[in-house]
């Protein structure tokens, strides 16, 4: 006799909404065996029994999860394998908090996953990452874990949160950040991943109180093309509203693009400047608020923004488009930016 | 001079409440994370709460959890620990310190308060 | 919850000894680690972060190693005011967690 399950494994981990076949099948010298499946749920799945052979078909629903057993049985002789088959959600639906990050600012970072099953500590793992590393000396906050709203009744599916407080990213900064979210499951490890760019900028604000031998201190070989004169900010080749930044955007490669600084002789007004070639002009496209409440002054290749009335920048987002191409520079000004004094 | 000083302690009933106090001097206390530990009496260090400087994160120790309210008041340069409920075991000296911005260890300490929970 | 323990739970020494103290976490807490001094009474006072770093103000005599789950707090020269409670504390993730404590008594 010869008593076989396939596949063959105790365990099997199926992904919630596909289909799955167990068959077992026994061979018998005296006869037919007799084969069959015990130990299901009214809802496991179902059963489909031939001549020395059943087959179990799960359809991939969460309520699926069990222990059956098939049992055969020839003569006098009996045989039976179980397998526990266990139903998992983990579609690639990473969300990351902030969607980039400032060096020099002690900041949280949180990447969740959504719509996830089981929503075990010891099956889900989060790493932040620099490159293939894990980001050294982050420090982990409390994990959250929350029921997600669900459209239909059912086993409800979960969604996990991990956050992190920063440490100082150096200078250079690392282009991006990762958060991976790794699940382990029987004989099976499925990894999602996000990015979370980092911000570049020339003048990165220092962190508070730091000595000269901390640890720690990432660095960085990646390096951004930014103009950022006089002001304490940061600019950004990038399409609105927030930057997604990779490694061959911070170089100075790919189309030509407008700059951004501090037109030192005007005190607080912002220039964007385009030197690709004749008959290009640029235009402010985005600032924090109301743009129409700022003045403009545009000439071609040139255009000014200044505050009304005259007063400190305001901090958020700034951006100027280059036409034709459509190319765009992002830059941001943080809160409370001292400029140089202008004589 | 950065220091920090707790104030509130005293003598509780089972089942009281009290509220702890930390004053802090000596550096910008919003741009900090706080703590409170304890040390019950003959006992090793316990976390219980953290905040961060704009109040935007708390977390609590299973022990205290549901029980015990971390709070700041950045212009008055505070830290409070609302304690209710308070049980035997919440007997101890506790201290607030301060979490050191991108490296997280507690680098102040203050000189603690005591709290005594008994009928 | 990571668990902090702390070899041994106390020590006899004398003045001028070389003392060691070591504190293994439950899982790695990378160099996530500081050490902490206890008079009766007192408050703890940080003398070494990130495993191995130096607090401002702490001699020299005082240093620390290690990283992932092993580490160890050195003094290499026992002084009569480093009779205290040491403690080890990691800081990777919370709950940030202590270990038991080491009692350094006068032998």
């Known amino acids: 006799q010869s008593f076989q399950v396939n596949p063959p494994e105790s365990e099997v981990a199926v992904a919630m909404g596909t289909s799955l076949q167990i068959t077992c099948s026994m061979s018998c010298d005296e006869g037919v065996a007799r084969v069959h499946w015990r130990g299901l749920d009214t809802s496991l799945g179902s059963v489909q029994t031939l001549p020395g052979s059943s087959i179990l078909s799960v359809r991939g629903m969460l309520s699926d999860t069990g222990t059956p057993v098939c049992v055969g049985s020839c003569g006098s002789r009996s045989f039976q394998h179980s397998v526990k088959i266990l139903v998992y959600a983990f579609p690639d639906q990473l969300v990351v908090s902030p969607e980039f990050l400032v060096p020099g600012q002690d900041q949280v970072v949180s990447c969740t996953a959504h719509n996830i099953w089981p929503a075990d500590p010891n099956s889900l793992s989060f790493a932040l990452l620099l490159g293939e590393q894990r980001l050294e000396g982050a420090q982990a906050l409390e994990p959250e874990q929350e029921e997600e709203i669900q459209e239909a009744e059912g086993t409800p599916l979960f969604r996990m949160t991990q956050r992190w407080r920063l440490p100082s990213l150096g200078t250079p900064a690392p282009p991006a950040l990762h958060c991976q979210v790794t699940m382990q499951l029987p004989k099976l490890v499925l990894t999602h991943r996000k990015e979370i760019p980092v911000l570049q900028s020339q003048t990165s604000p220092k962190p508070p109180n730091t000595t000269s031998a901390e640890p720690y201190i990432l660095t960085s070989s990646s390096t951004a093309e930014a103009v950022s004169t006089g002001l304490n900010i940061t600019t950004l080749p990038s399409a609105p509203p927030y930057p997604k930044l990779s490694p061959r955007t911070l170089s100075s490669e790919g189309p030509c693009r407008p700059k951004i600084h501090q037109d030192l002789e005007a005190g607080w007004e912002l220039l964007c400047e385009a030197s690709c070639g004749p008959g290009v002009t640029v235009r402010w496209t985005l600032a924090p608020g109301d743009l129409a409440t700022y003045h403009k002054r545009e000439a071609g290749a040139q255009a000014w923004l200044s505050v009304l009335p005259p007063g400190p920048m305001v901090e958020g987002w700034f951006q100027c488009r280059q036409d034709p191409g459509g190319e765009v520079t992002n830059l941001y000004v943080p809160g409370q930016v001292t400029p140089n004094s202008s004589s | 001079e950065v220091q920090l000083l707790e104030s509130g302690g005293g003598l509780v009933q089972p089942g009281g409440s009290l509220r702890l106090s930390c004053a802090a001097s000596?550096?910008?206390?919003?741009?900090?994370?706080m703590h409170w530990v304890r040390q019950a009496p003959g006992k090793g260090l316990e976390w219980i709460s953290y905040?961060?400087?704009?109040?935007?994160?708390?977390n609590y120790a299973d022990s205290v959890k549901g029980r015990f309210t971390i709070s700041r008041d950045n212009s008055k340069n505070t830290l409070y620990l609302q304690m209710n409920s308070l049980r035997a075991e919440d007997t101890a000296v506790y201290y607030c310190?301060?979490?050191?911005?991108?490296?997280?260890?507690?680098?102040?300490w203050g000189k603690g308060t005591t709290v005594t929970v008994s009928s | 919850d990571i668990q902090m323990t702390q070899s041994p739970s106390s020590l006899s020494a004398s003045v001028g000894d070389r003392v060691t103290i070591t504190c293994r976490a439950s899982?790695?807490?990378?160099?996530?680690l500081a050490w902490y001094q206890q008079k009766p009474g007192k408050a703890p006072k940080l003398l070494i972060y990130?495993?191995?770093s130096l607090q401002s103000g702490v001699p020299s005599r005082f240093s620390g190693s290690g990283s992932g789950t092993d580490f160890t707090l050195t003094i290499s020269s026992l002084q009569p005011e480093d009779f205290a409670t040491y403690y080890c504390?990691?800081?990777?993730?919370?709950?940030?967690?202590f270990g038991q404590g080491t009692k350094v008594e006068i032998k």
């Open positions: 899982q790695s807490v990378s160099r996530s």
């Open positions: 000596g550096f910008t206390f919003s741009d900090y994370w």
């Open positions: 504390q990691q800081y990777k993730s919370y709950p940030v967690t």
């Open positions: 990130a495993a191995s």
């Open positions: 905040i961060s400087g704009d109040s935007g994160y708390t």
């Open positions: 310190a301060r979490d050191r911005p991108y490296y997280y260890y507690m680098d102040v």
